[in-house]
C-alpha cells in the first residue's frame, strides 16, 4: 500500500454507500471502487505525476524552505463516472449511467 | 496565515527565482507571487472549495474511518500565467507574456 514514504499513486478504496449515508438514495451498487490518491510528491517530480509548473516551483521552494512551504499534494487529476440506480421523486427506480466524478482515473502532484 | 487548523484557502507565497535555481534562465522578474493553497479540507466541504464528488465521498469516508482514509487535499484548482523575460537558446532576451500555470488563481479540495 502507498504509505507516506511512497510516491504518489492510485490505491484501492472500496466505499460502502451505507457507511457514508448515501444508501438512502443510491439503491445499487451497495459499494464501489472509488480509489484514493496516496503517497508523497517528492523531488524530483516524475512525469507520471503530471506536475504543473506551480507544483514544480512549490516542490523546489519546499526543498529550500521545508518548514515554510509544504510539498505539492497527491490528488486525483482525472475522475471517472460510475453507474448508479436511484429512486427518483416519483419512486421510480432510475439508472444514471454516468454519475460523474466518483472514481479516480489518475493521480498527480498539484 | 492559513495553518493546519484553518480551512483551505489561497495564501501568499513569494518565490525568488534565485532560491530555486531558475535565475540562470529567467532574467526578470526576480521574484513573483506564486501563492500557495493551505489549510484543511474539513467536513462539511464548503461550496467555495468546489469539491468534486470524489472529494465529498473521501471526506465522508475519512469521517467514519479517519485512520484508514485521508482527508481531501487543498490544492490549486485554477492557475494563472505570469510574464517572464528569459534567455533563449541563442542567449537572446525574449519576453514570454503567458508563461502558463505559474500562479494560483483558485484553491479547492480534491
Amino acid at each position: 500500500s502507498a504509505g507516506a514514504g511512497s510516491h504518489c499513486q492510485k490505491t484501492s478504496l472500496r466505499v460502502n454507500f451505507e457507511d457514508i449515508g448515501w444508501d438512502s438514495w443510491i439503491i445499487a451498487p451497495k459499494e464501489y471502487e472509488a480509489y484514493e490518491c496516496k503517497g508523497g510528491c517528492f523531488f524530483p517530480l516524475a512525469d507520471d505525476v503530471t506536475p504543473t509548473k506551480h507544483a514544480i516551483v512549490q516542490t523546489l521552494v519546499h526543498l529550500k524552505f521545508p518548514t515554510k512551504v509544504g510539498k505539492a499534494c497527491c490528488v486525483p487529476t482525472k475522475l471517472s463516472p460510475i453507474s448508479v440506480l436511484y429512486k427518483d421523486d416519483m419512486g421510480v427506480p432510475t439508472l444514471k449511467y454516468h454519475y460523474e466524478g466518483m472514481s479516480v482515473a489518475e493521480c498527480g502532484c498539484r | 496565515s492559513a495553518g493546519a487548523g484553518s480551512h483551505c484557502q489561497k495564501t501568499s507565497l513569494r518565490v525568488n527565482f534565485e532560491d530555486i535555481g531558475w535565475d540562470s534562465w529567467i532574467i526578470a522578474p526576480k521574484e513573483y507571487e506564486a501563492y500557495e493553497c493551505k489549510g484543511g479540507c474539513f467536513f462539511p466541504l464548503a461550496d467555495d472549495v468546489t469539491p468534486t464528488k470524489h472529494a465529498i465521498v473521501q471526506t465522508l469516508v475519512h469521517l467514519k474511518f479517519p485512520t484508514k482514509v485521508g482527508k481531501a487535499c487543498c490544492v490549486p484548482t485554477k492557475l494563472s500565467p505570469i510574464s517572464v523575460l528569459y534567455k533563449d537558446d541563442m542567449g537572446v532576451p525574449t519576453l514570454k507574456y503567458h508563461y502558463e500555470g505559474m500562479s494560483v488563481a483558485e484553491c479547492g479540495c480534491r
Epitope: 439503491i27 445499487a28 451498487p29 451497495k30 459499494e31 464501489y32 460510475i82 453507474s83 448508479v84 440506480l85 427518483d88 416519483m90 419512486g91 421510480v92 427506480p93 432510475t94 439508472l95 449511467y97 | -
Partner: antibody
Framework: QVQLQQPGAEAVKPGASVKLSCKAS????????MHWVKQRPGQGLEWIGE????????NYNEKFKSKATLTVDKSSSTAYMQLSSLTSEDFAVYYC???????????WGQGTLVTVSA | DIVLTQSPASLAVSLGQRATISCRAS??????????MNWFQQKPGQPPKFLIY???NQGSGVPARFSGSGSGTDFSLNIHPLEEDDTAMYFC?????????FGGGTKLEIK
C-alpha cells in the same frame, strides 16, 4: 397519483388490425418509457416492446416486430399499440406499463382484453 | 434472449411459514454492480404488482414480509410469514437486456 387508463376490451375480426390506447396521468408523460406486455389467458407474461415518449424511440421484442407498432401522442399523454393481421394467437390481455431506463415496470394499466373472432 | 427459469411451478405453504421461489437466468444479470432482477405478484383479474427490484429492494408500499436476494444468475423471492392474501402468481423479470423477459411464473397457494 399515477394512472394508466386502458379500455377493458376490444373485439376484432381475424385478419383485421386494432389500435390499443393507454392514457397516462399523474406524472410527466415524456419522462418515462412506456412498455407493452402480453398475457394469454392462464399463461405467463411476454414483453412486446417499449417506447420513449420524449422522442418516439422504440425497442421491440423480435417476436412482435411484424405484429406490433408502438406510437405516442404527447399532446394527450397517450401511448398506442397497433396490432395487425390478428389471429387466435393474439387473443390475450395487453397491458401498458410505465418504467424508467432501468426497465422495471412500476405502474400498470388494468389491461385490455383483445378477442379475435369472426 | 435471456431465459429465466422459475421453480417450483407451484407450491403450497402453510400460513405463517416461509415460501421461497427461485429464478435462474441463462446469463448473469449483473452490470455496474447492479443486479437487473425484478419480482412481480399477480392476482386473478389484476395486473402484476411491482414487488422487488434490483434483486433485493422493495417497491413502494410492499410489506417487509417480501424480500429478494441473489446475484449473477441465481435469485430468490422469500415471503415470511405467509399470509392468506399472498395467494397469487409470482413472476421474475430481467431488465438487463432487450428483450425484457419474464420467468414462467410460480403459483403460490396457502395450505
Amino acid at each position: 397519483q399515477v394512472q394508466l387508463q386502458q379500455p377493458g376490451a376490444e373485439a376484432v375480426k381475424p385478419g383485421a388490425s386494432v389500435k390499443l390506447s393507454c392514457k397516462a396521468s399523474g406524472y410527466t408523460f415524456t419522462r418515462y418509457w412506456m412498455h407493452w406486455v402480453k398475457q394469454r389467458p392462464g399463461q405467463g407474461l411476454e414483453w412486446i416492446g417499449e417506447i420513449n415518449p420524449s422522442n418516439g424511440g422504440t425497442n421491440y421484442n423480435e417476436k412482435f416486430k411484424s405484429k406490433a407498432t408502438l406510437t405516442v401522442d404527447k399532446s394527450s399523454s397517450t401511448a398506442y399499440m397497433q396490432l395487425s393481421s390478428l389471429t387466435s394467437e393474439d387473443f390475450a390481455v395487453y397491458y401498458c406499463t410505465m418504467g424508467s431506463n432501468y426497465g422495471g415496470f412500476v405502474y400498470w394499466g388494468q389491461g385490455t382484453l383483445v378477442t379475435v373472432s369472426a | 434472449d435471456i431465459v429465466l427459469t422459475q421453480s417450483p411451478a407451484s407450491l403450497a405453504v402453510s400460513l405463517g411459514q416461509r415460501a421461497t421461489i427461485s429464478c435462474r437466468a441463462s446469463e448473469s444479470l449483473d452490470n455496474y454492480g447492479i443486479s437487473f432482477m425484478n419480482w412481480f405478484q399477480q392476482k386473478p383479474g389484476q395486473p402484476p404488482k411491482f414487488l422487488i427490484y434490483a434483486a433485493s429492494n422493495q417497491g413502494s408500499g410492499v410489506p417487509a414480509r417480501f424480500s429478494g436476494s441473489g446475484s449473477g444468475t441465481d435469485f430468490s423471492l422469500n415471503i415470511h410469514p405467509l399470509e392468506e392474501d399472498d395467494t397469487a402468481m409470482y413472476f421474475c423479470q430481467q431488465s438487463k437486456e432487450v428483450p425484457r423477459t419474464f420467468g414462467g411464473g410460480t403459483k403460490l397457494e396457502i395450505k
